[in-house]
């Protein structure tokens, strides 16, 4: 990595956390919908 240690920056970490949160919300919603449809 040409960025060296700076690849693990807080701004990148925050973006990853936001994506994880979004995916968890979407998957959770889908799961609830599936249970409801059953």
């Amino acid at each position: 990595h040409s960025d060296g240690i700076f690849t693990d920056s807080y701004s990148r970490y925050r973006k990853q956390m936001a994506v994880k949160k979004y995916l968890a919300a979407v998957l959770g919603k889908r799961y609830k919908q599936r249970v409801k449809n059953k």
């Epitope: 990595h1 960025d3 060296g4 240690i5 700076f6 690849t7 693990d8 920056s9 807080y10 701004s11 970490y13």
Partner: antibody
């Protein structure tokens, strides 16, 4: 996501000591991990860092005195090769490259004869 | 070696007041912005406040403000609260993959 240090204890001068940083909730394959120390009543002192590719970098004063290594996907070690009384401090592990955004509670190392 | 000089070493202000802490680096930090600020209370690890000179970390009140670039940086705490009494540290990340901390500033709230 958290980090925790372990291995701090009372050692005699010259006795090698290895501290361990255990991470949870993230992988070391995407993280840079630092060791920072703080002598009693003193300020923070950066020792060194291991990046996500296992490359290591040290403060000029720490070269040869400390060795940082990745020992598993969740642990990073700090080896103190030949501690002196001046190495008495709380040793912290912290995640981040160029900034330190997740800290452990620290582990106390006392070097005394 | 890179040196971070923090001034003053101690500062006192009343509740509701403002304090300013300066951090000067002997050479430019990475990208001119890799300067962060931390708050530490006795017996606790440091708490991450500000990253890349001026960005607030998650959960940090907007009373904390970071500014500066290159070699000169400032942390300003406004509307001081009793809970702000602590020691504050700046830290720099350098393009050589080396990092360092300032000497710390003790903030006393009267």
């Amino acid at each position: 996501q958290s980090v925790e240090e372990s291995g701090g204890r009372l050692v005699t001068p010259g006795t090698p000591l290895t501290l361990t940083c255990t991470v949870s909730g993230f992988s070391l394959s995407s993280a840079a991990m630092n060791w920072v120390r703080q002598a009693p009543g003193k300020g923070l002192e950066w020792i060194g860092i291991i990046d996500n590719t296992a490359g290591t970098y040290y403060a000029p004063w720490a070269k040869g005195r400390f060795t940082i290594s990745k020992t598993s996907s969740t642990t990073v070690d700090l080896k103190m090769t030949s501690p002196t009384t001046e190495d008495t401090a709380t040793y912290f592990c912290a995640r981040g490259g160029g900034e330190f955004f997740i800290w452990g509670p620290g582990t106390l190392v006392t070097v005394s004869s | 070696a890179q040196v971070l000089t923090q001034t003053p070493s101690s500062v006192s202000a009343a509740v509701g007041g403002t304090v300013t802490i300066n951090c000067q680096s002997s050479q430019s930090v990475h990208d001119g912005s890799y300067l962060s600020w931390y708050q530490q209370k006795p017996g606790q690890p440091p708490n991450f406040l500000i990253y890349q000179a001026s960005n607030l970390a998650s959960g940090v009140p907007s009373r904390f403000k970071g500014s500066g670039s290159g070699t000169q940086f400032t942390l300003t705490i406004s509307d001081l609260e009793c809970d702000d009494a602590a020691t504050y540290y700046c830290a720099g990340g350098y393009s050589s993959n080396i990092c360092g901390f300032g000497g710390g500033t003790e903030v006393v709230v009267k």
